[in-house]
Amino acid sequence: MRWCLLLIWAQGLRQAPLASGMMTGTIETTGNISAEKGGSIILQCHLSSTTAQVTQVNWEQQDQLLAICNADLGWHISPSFKDRVAPGPGLGLTLQSLTVNDTGEYFCIYHTYPDGTYTGRIFLEVLESSVAEHGARFQIPLLGAMAATLVVICTAVIVVVALTRKKKALRIHSVEGDLRRKSAGQEEWSPSAPSPPGSCVQAEAAPAGLCGEQRGEDCAELHDYFNVLSYRSLGNCSFFTETG
């Protein structure tokens, strides 16, 4: 049993039980993000509000397959991205050595049973280092002014709502803020314990071949949820080939 399986199982625990028979889940993503050329960025999605089992997560950029995390099999990184893409954290994907050409839409495609496929979209803008620095110098005072204005407006709105709605509470929920906190803390995406072998996990007959369409609709079933809890850590060993 493997690491990705544990992550998927843990995600399953967090999902609220809802009526089955229709696609009730929602994908939360980090939304629109920007990063500097040469840097790294974590792409992160989170499926919630469904009890469906996540069997596979595909990461795609426009029409190109970047990586697959399969509950049965593990990670497969597309050969053309193998030097710049790292699996994780969790079911996410880390893009390294960013270039301006990496700017664009990225999709996390969750294959689930019995719901089917959920897709999340992230837009990444890769900025030239100088542009990012130059932009930051001028944006700081502007952002400060904007923030102050927003605080005033928000306060006024809250007062008005409070007065008009009397004692009805106003709930403000920021998906992006949640995801950033989760990502920073990691515990939402990956336990802090040493990783057992197989973040996500193995084998031959999954999608990602030589020719043809880059989107695989078939994916393996998630099996044996609970055995993963007894999976032993390997300790501090270097890369090896599993023989059994």
């Epitope: 050969p79 072998p197 193995q202 084998a203 031959e204 030589l210 989107r215 270097s238 090896f240």
Partner: antibody, heavy 127, light 110 residues
Framework: EVQLLESGGGLVQPGGSLRLSCAAS????????MSWVRQAPGKGLEWVSA????????YYADSVKGRFTISRDNSKNTLYLQMNSLRAEDTAVYYC????????????????????WGQGTLVTVSS | QSVLTQPPSASGTPGQRVTISCSCS????????VSWYQQLPGTAPKLLIY???NRPSGVPDRFSGSKSGTSASLAISGLRSEDEADYYC???????????FGGGTKLTVL
């Protein structure tokens, strides 16, 4: 030593059935996807079917869809291929093969290829 | 007809370097993983290369895999008589949901 041993081949009439078995040893069978690949006399390799470790995701070549059924018994470390409605063109040596996986401390990666093959079993469909 | 196209035959003299190509008849080969297999006469196939260019343990470094554009290649340097065999490329095909093999290349050592 990692080994795959096929059995169950033989002579069968067109329209008949046959069940091939592949006994695996030397590795944790339940962790790996497995495939059947065949080779007609004097011809090239033709992939037939594959099954994921848990047995829930299965793939078939168009030429055998609806006639062949792949299955596995992880408790017996055995892969099966049930072949029904056999045709003369199904005559071939049938190999079972194990998928590739490598693991690091934190991740296992799967690749597209078969790193261990059995010796093959001959299936002849003829009247 | 196979989705992967290989030359039916190739030849070389001992010590020479030979290259066998495997081209994709449809989309770009770049995003997909190629494996290479050797089949000596009367034996089961053996994996030579996986994930485009990786050699399993036990495969001599005379064998190497590469990929460029719409074609993958298997190179054999320092050719030996025991390299005389059939060579197949293979890959998973998304559109077919199937593993596909090239038609095979018969290598003759002159």
């Amino acid at each position: 030593e990692v080994q795959l041993l096929e059995s169950g081949g033989g002579l069968v009439q067109p329209g008949g059935s046959l069940r091939l078995s592949c006994a695996a040893s030397g590795f944790t069978f339940s962790n790996y996807a497995m495939s059947w690949v065949r080779q007609a006399p004097g011809k090239g390799l033709e992939w037939v079917s594959a099954i994921y470790p848990g047995g829930g995701s299965i793939y078939y070549a168009d030429s055998v869809k609806g006639r062949f059924t792949i299955s596995r018994d992880n408790s017996k470390n055995t892969l099966y291929l049930q072949m029904n409605s056999l045709r003369a063109e199904d005559t071939a040596v049938y190999y079972c093969a194990k998928a590739i996986r490598t693991c690091s401390l934190s991740h296992c990666y799967y690749y597209y290829g078969m790193d261990v093959w059995g010796q093959g079993t001959l299936v002849t469909v003829s009247s | 007809q196979s989705v992967l196209t290989q030359p039916p035959s190739a030849s070389g003299t001992p010590g020479q370097r030979v290259t066998i190509s495997c081209s994709c008849s449809s989309s770009n080969i770049g995003n997909n993983a190629v494996s290479w297999y050797q089949q000596l006469p009367g034996t089961a196939p053996k994996l030579l290369i996986y994930y485009d260019s990786n050699r399993p343990s036990g495969v001599p470094d005379r064998f190497s895999g590469s990929k460029s554009g719409t074609s993958a290649s298997l190179a054999i340097s320092g050719l030996r008589s025991e390299d005389e065999a059939d060579y197949y490329c293979g890959s998973w095909d998304y559109s077919l949901s199937a593993y596909v093999f090239g038609g095979g290349t018969k290598l003759t050592v002159l």
